[in-house]
């Protein structure tokens, strides 16, 4: 369905409000350092131009591609070279190379100030004074800090953000109403960003086939009553949506996502019995709800998998005729029977099955060769089961903060070259798997835990890719998407690491720690713990625990002191000196 003017087509499909919001997100995700006002100006110019194309699709430049129009607009920014350096060279290229160039310069860890939440009254005043600007600013600030945030989902977050302010700024106790809602949006937003980052990494680093395999497994778990052909259609459409969003084609992505939600709801009888409530909601809520919908019940009396995939004499014939379709059917059949497995485990099983068929279908007696293929699955299934059992036991024993600390020590010893902020951020997130997943019954633990860990380890991979410092991280991140977690789990202490020179400044603390939130205080202590391990990688976990407990006692004492700063200076020197002696620093 070719349109004379792509920009007019998307403007009409999406409506002005969504069009403007999505263009703002796109621009902020590309030019992450540009001031808000500059982006608003660019968006208004693009919107005015789109309106002329709606009025007359044959008007000048209306036939240009969205990449051409948007790229030309971004390249009008006066300070491009001063602000972005070599990214300005993208503007010398032609499409599609120019867009690819912009994509390559997206920064997962932009040097932007932390978002500080103003007082509730200040926020409510700003909201009432200019609601439109207030909400645009939200989109801009999130998009520039999360350059791969799933754009149509960000529109859903913005809608909830607006609803929170609309309700709470009229409440008797504004803060009690608003702050929990903002906390929830922040936490959900970070999780959503990280999940989408994994989808984009999967597409960009491992290709469409890898993403489609992930989607087959996940959708088959979620919609086990749907036919294989139905799941395949959904996978194709979903892949298109995410390819577009990850490629910066946000208007097409949002439009196609809406079409996919419409299709799913029109065909829910052949997809899932769990979609009814979702499909009664407005568009943004509907798409979000479908993406999060619980797994449907498995059909009763599903036959054994072995009949079609091991015992049949036609296995090699079927495989040879259409390899990816046959493997897709295997993955579909296995996944719909195993909502208790993680997606990455299902993909490992499919890969093992594929490798076995590749080998055996060339053998003298193929059937004899692949007859025991399902036996090879047992250790692959048991490994994550055991790991999750051990770590959940450790989590129950230690609680979240100390469990995070155990992981901090574990990962710092594995990859001590990684920057301290990255190790702290990633280990804290790894540690959240406990409270997120260990509460679930056995049947839900593995999909919760291992698929969450895949998301967190991808954060490590994308942050490390920006400034690579560890061959071991590079190896685990690039060799196999589905084996990242087992690869990191298998890493032992890095014996080649030369301990970091001791720097007393790293362990110097001031009275400002006393006024920090509990979370910020934890991060300070965890930063010190990572540095301690980097200085003394051979320290035992008992030694590190003792030093950290003493450090906590020192902070507690000095925060109670009348002259806090003097206490931190004098007692801190003693603590550092004693720690140096005790750990042989």
């Amino acid at each position: 369905d070719a349109h004379k003017s792509e920009v007019a087509h998307r403007f009409k499909d999406l409506g002005e409000e969504n069009f403007k919001a999505l263009v703002l997100i796109a621009f902020a995700q590309y030019l992450q350092q540009c001031p808000f006002e500059d982006h608003v100006k660019l968006v208004n110019e693009v919107t005015e131009f789109a309106k002329t194309c709606v009025a007359d699709e044959s008007a000048e430049n209306c036939d240009k591609s969205l990449h051409t129009l948007f790229g030309d607009k971004l390249c009008t920014v006066a300070t491009l070279r001063e602000t972005y350096g070599e990214m300005a060279d993208c503007c010398a290229k032609q499409e599609p190379e120019r867009n690819e160039c912009f994509l390559q310069h997206k920064d997962d860890n932009p040097n932007l100030p932390r978002l500080v939440r103003p007082e509730v009254d200040v926020m409510c005043t700003a909201f009432h004074d200019n609601e439109e600007t207030f909400l645009k600013k939200y989109l801009y600030e999130i998009a520039r800090r999360h350059p791969y945030f799933y754009a149509p989902e960000l529109l859903f977050f913005a809608k909830r953000y607006k609803a929170a302010f609309t309700e709470c700024c009229q409440a008797a106790d504004k803060a009690a109403c608003l702050l929990p809602k903002l906390d929830e949006l922040r936490d959900e937003g970070k999780a959503s960003s990280a999940k989408q980052r994994l989808k984009c990494a999967s597409l960009q680093k491992f290709g469409e086939r890898a993403f489609k395999a992930w989607a087959v497994a996940r959708l088959s778990q979620r919609f086990p009553k749907a036919e294989f052909a139905e799941v395949s259609k959904l996978v194709t459409d979903l892949t298109k949506v995410h390819t577009e969003c990850c490629h910066g084609d946000l208007l097409e992505c949002a439009d196609d996502r809406a079409d996919l939600a419409k299709y799913i709801c029109e065909n829910q009888d052949s997809i899932s019995s769990k979609l009814k409530e979702c499909c009664e909601k407005p568009l943004l809520e509907k798409s979000h709800c479908i993406a999060e919908v619980e797994n449907d019940e498995m059909p009763a009396d599903l036959p054994s998998l072995a009949a079609d995939f091991v015992e049949s004499k036609d296995v090699c014939k079927n495989y040879a005729e259409a390899k990816d379709v046959f493997l897709g059917m295997f993955l579909y059949e296995y996944a719909r029977r195993h909502p208790d497995y993680s997606v990455v485990l299902l993909l490992r099983l499919a890969k093992t099955y594929e490798t076995t068929l590749e080998k055996c279908c060339a053998a003298a007696d193929p059937h004899e060769c692949y007859a025991k293929v399902f036996d090879e699955f047992k250790p692959l299934v048991e490994e994550p089961q055991n790991l999750i059992k051990q770590n959940c036991e450790l989590f129950e024993q230690l609680g979240e903060y100390k469990f995070q600390n155990a992981l901090l020590v574990r990962y710092t010893k594995k990859v001590p070259q990684v920057s301290t902020p990255t190790l702290v951020e990633v280990s804290r997130n790894l540690g959240k798997v406990g409270s997120k997943c260990c509460k679930h019954p056995e049947a839900k633990r593995m999909p919760c835990a291992e698929d969450y860990l895949s998301v967190v380890l991808n954060q490590l991979c994308v942050l490390h890719e920006k400034t690579p410092v560890s061959d071991r991280v590079t190896k685990c991140c690039t060799e196999s998407l589905v084996n990242r977690r087992p690869c990191f789990s298998a890493l032992e202490v890095d014996e080649t690491y030369v301990p970091k020179e001791f720097n007393a400044e790293t362990f110097t603390f001031h009275a400002d720690i006393c006024t920090l939130s509990e979370k910020e205080r934890q991060i300070k202590k965890q930063t010190a713990l990572v540095e301690l391990v980097k200085h003394k990688p051979k320290a035992t976990k008992e030694q590190l625990k003792a030093v950290m407990d003493d450090f906590a006692a020192f902070v507690e004492k000095c925060c109670k002191a009348d002259d806090k700063e003097t206490c931190f200076a004098e007692e801190g020197k003693k603590l550092v000196a004693a720690s140096q002696a005790a750990l042989g620093l």
Partner: nanobody, 118 residues
Amino acid sequence: QVQLQESGGGLVQPGGSLRLSCAASGFAFSSFPMTWVRQAPGKGLEWVSGILEGGGSPAYADSVKGRFTISRDDAKNTLYLQMNSLKPEDTAVYYCAKGYVYAREGARSQGTQVTVSS
């Protein structure tokens, strides 16, 4: 409540030895790291030695390394400091405390005087 009581201090000639003991009660002694600290006349508190629960990883300040030995007997809820080759600069009030490298507030003993003099 936490109670720590030392004994074994006294006057000793340079080169001599002393063994300090610290009897603990009011807490699960075997579950905590313990430490010895000292305070010389007109000086601040100085960390001397620490030992982890279970008796692991004894650690010493450079000034006493090779001369002092920390140990514990969890069955008797007692911490020890064997001090050999004593020097005049070891003269101080010695305290035992909960902690490994930092004496916890509110968990320190009354102290025992050690004087090294000819």
